[in-house]
């Protein structure tokens, strides 16, 4: 027995107390307006399509449609008794995108199209999304609209993030093949791009791809190998979107940051995290440059976003994504350093300014504390049994450190007979001494290494 659920109340005149399916009239295989229940709610009948008359003797509207009398009053049993006719109108008024890639004015029109399609033995049309095809549905009151501040930042900065590809020549055929890629970001409307120096290393042809897919040959304008910053230039007609540099000196630990890069054509990769430590002395983290500082973050920095910007929630660049030491520890070159580089680069190109020399050995390091040592020991079983010293994150190729035999993961524990407690100690000795006789803990043995610092441009 069918219940009379869904039937209008009060009951329409002449309805049986119980529904008897056997007494329902046969229905055609296809209904233009879809199926509906009759006025009594007993039998399935063909509903009237959108725009058709309803009420009176016309029968009910199809699925998703409601019977509306003039002035927009929905038809009820009372209206019907007053013998007024209405029109079938879709209960949903917003556009929808169908699986056939067509935009329909409302859900009812999509359903009608789906029925027509099935009648022709084609796949049904289903709803892919609310709103027109190719257009997101933006409900300004939705939670995702209100609280996706990371996505807002990404949307704002992405057009100025570029994909950089390097090509090498095969040794005999001289054919060019891609060898590496990284990211960069545009800093001037006429096509100056900042990236890591290690992204655009020597002997390679550099190609830049913008977010819109346009590709350009890039010229290397200036490189600071020690600070790991490079400036490259593309020739582009018209204005390019740019990113502004924020003040890394004003960063606070705990601030949200977003690392973005473009590791593949037309695609961005986004990671997010917080600032763990601001301005780790370089000094603390390395000697590409003795006054170099780094921002430490737990936002994942990898080959894909290396060279790309690390931005704050205002979309300002506060660093260049530069390297990952180990899980959860990544570093960025602070924007204040980028500003300095850009200013000096401008001066150099304008008037070939003389530069004072600095001493350099070619390592990146960080001060080892007991907690940091424990963390590293947990990750690497063979990490040395030390709780202080200067931990070497990276040895830069073709530098005094490499020539002397320093290796990644070494811990410097003394130089010229003086014990080394922190990375600062190493920086200070480099400034003073012309020869560094180091004792280095490697695994569980102590090794004597001699490094001769070289004088470099800052």
């Amino acid at each position: 027995q069918l219940s009379r659920a869904g039937r209008s109340a009060p009951l329409a005149a002449g309805c049986p107390d119980r529904c008897e399916p056997a007494r329902c009239p046969p229905q055609p295989e296809h209904c233009e307006g879809g199926r509906a229940r009759d006025a009594c709610g007993c039998c399935e009948v063909c509903g009237a399509p959108e725009g058709a008359a309803c009420g009176l003797q016309e029968g009910p509207c199809g699925e998703g449609l409601q019977c509306v009398v003039p002035f927009g009053v929905p038809a009820s049993a009372t209206v019907r008794r007053r013998a007024q006719a209405g029109l079938c109108v879709c209960a949903s008024s917003e556009p929808v995108c169908g699986s056939d890639a067509n935009t329909y004015a409302n859900l009812c029109q999509l359903r009608a199209a789906s029925r027509r399609s099935e009648r022709l033995h084609r796949p049904p049309v289903i709803v892919l999304q609310r709103g027109a095809c190719g257009q997101g549905q933006e409900d300004p009151n939705s939670l995702r609209h209100k609280y996706n501040f990371i996505a807002d930042v990404v949307e704002k900065i992405a057009p100025a993030v570029v994909h950089i590809e390097l090509f090498r020549k095969l040794p005999f055929s001289k054919r060019e093949v891609p060898v590496a890629s990284g990211s960069g970001f545009i800093v001037s409307e006429d096509g100056l791009i900042v990236t890591n120096a290690h992204v655009v290393t020597n002997k390679h042809r550099v190609k830049v791809e913008l977010k819109n897919g346009a590709t350009y040959e890039a010229k290397i304008k200036d490189v600071d190998e020690k600070a790991d910053i490079a400036l490259i230039k593309i020739d582009h007609q018209g204005k390019l979107p740019v990113l502004l540099l924020g003040r890394s000196s004003e960063l606070r630990p705990g601030e949200f940051v977003v690392a973005i890069g473009s590791p593949f054509s037309l695609q961005n990769t986004v990671t997010t995290g917080i600032v763990s430590t601001t301005q780790r002395g370089g000094k603390e983290l390395g000697l590409r440059n003795s006054d170099m500082d780094y921002i430490q973050t737990d936002a994942i920095i990898n080959y894909g976003n290396s060279g790309g910007p690390l931005v704050n929630l205002d979309g300002e660049v506060i660093g260049i994504n530069t390297l990952k030491v180990t899980a959860g520890i990544s570093f960025a070159i602070p924007s204040d350093k980028i500003k300095k580089f850009l200013t000096e680069s401008h001066d150099r190109q304008a008037k070939g300014k003389a530069i004072t020399k600095k001493k350099y050995i070619g390592i990146r390091m960080m001060s080892l504390t007991s907690s940091k040592a424990k963390e590293l020991k947990d990750r690497h079983r063979d990490f040395p049994d030390v709780i202080s010293g200067a931990y070497i994150i990276e040895v830069i190729p073709d530098t005094p450190a490499e020539a002397g035999g320093l290796k990644e993961n070494d811990v410097i524990i003394s130089i010229n007979g003086q014990s080394v407690v922190s990375a600062n100690d190493v920086s200070d000795v480099i400034k003073r001494e012309s020869t560094l006789n180091m004792v280095v803990r490697r695994g569980n043995e102590d090794i004597m290494i001699t490094v001769i610092p070289e004088e470099i441009d800052p």
């Epitope: 095969l170 040794p171 020539a403």
Partner: antibody, heavy 123, light 105 residues
Framework: QVQLVQSGAEVKKPGASVKVSCKAS????????MHWVRQAPGQRLEWMGA????????AYNQKFKGRVTITADKSASTAYMELSSLRSEDTAVYYC????????????????WGQGTLVTVSS | DIQMTQSPSSLSASVGDRVTITCSVS?????MYWYQQKPGKAPKLLIY???NLASGVPSRFSGSGSGTDFTFTISSLQPEDIATYYC????????FGQGTKLEIK
């Protein structure tokens, strides 16, 4: 992981030809040149030639010019080295080896090698 | 053609010893490469671009030099280091040194 698998040992008569194959896997075959290096018993390694699998372009050691032919089948990711007019001094282990490249310095070397194919030339 | 002279052609050392092999070339090259070859096996790259350690190679192996004179060093010889070592340059085309056979005393 990168693997180069060579065909099996061959015994040939003087004057004959030998064709050794090298099937590559684990990398984009057309992004690197494939080289052939041989080692006669108790001798140093000797470079024979190379091929760019994408274009079929080749380079040969003058010592073997006219006797060695290197080819490649892109669809099968396989390189071939054919040495003709064999003589007893061609008895050696023949290796295919992939050209490696140093990103930092831009230098070339051989980073992956096949297991070697012993070719014995004897009457 | 660039001529390569590797010395010594053979050497015997004890476990724990520091071992040095030299390679001289007839005209200046940018980089030197070093390989290890064990009997019946293909050569294995140890050092590239003169001084860079190839992936997975123990840190006891090192290389140095420039121009025409290059050095390969094993800081503390291990039993598994018994092999023949080759230097290789690549200017016009690749050539190899004649090899140094290393044995344990």
């Amino acid at each position: 992981q990168v693997q180069l698998v060579q065909s099996g040992a061959e015994v040939k008569k003087p004057g004959a030809s030998v064709k050794v194959s090298c099937k590559a896997s684990g990398y984009t075959f057309t992004d690197y040149e494939m080289h052939w290096v041989r080692q006669a018993p108790g001798q140093r390694l000797e470079w024979m030639g190379a091929i760019d699998p994408e274009t079929g372009g080749t380079a040969y050691n003058q010592k073997f010019k006219g006797r060695v032919t290197i080819t490649a089948d892109k669809s099968a990711s396989t390189a071939y080295m054919e040495l003709s007019s064999l003589r007893s001094e061609d008895t050696a282990v023949y290796y295919c080896t992939r050209e490696g490249y140093s990103y930092e310095g831009g230098g070339y070397y051989f980073d992956y090698w096949g297991q070697g194919t012993l070719v014995t030339v004897s009457s | 053609d660039i001529q390569m002279t590797q010395s010594p052609s053979s050497l015997s050392a004890s476990v724990g010893d520091r071992v040095t092999i030299t390679c001289s070339v007839s005209s200046s090259v940018s980089y030197m490469y070093w390989y290890q070859q064990k009997p019946g096996k293909a050569p294995k790259l140890l050092i590239y671009d003169t001084s860079n350690l190839a992936s997975g190679v123990p840190s006891r192996f090192s290389g140095s030099g420039s121009g025409t004179d290059f050095t390969f060093t094993i800081s503390s010889l291990q039993p598994e280091d018994i092999a023949t070592y080759y230097c290789q340059q690549w200017s016009d085309y690749p050539t190899f040194g004649q090899g140094t056979k290393l044995e344990i005393k």
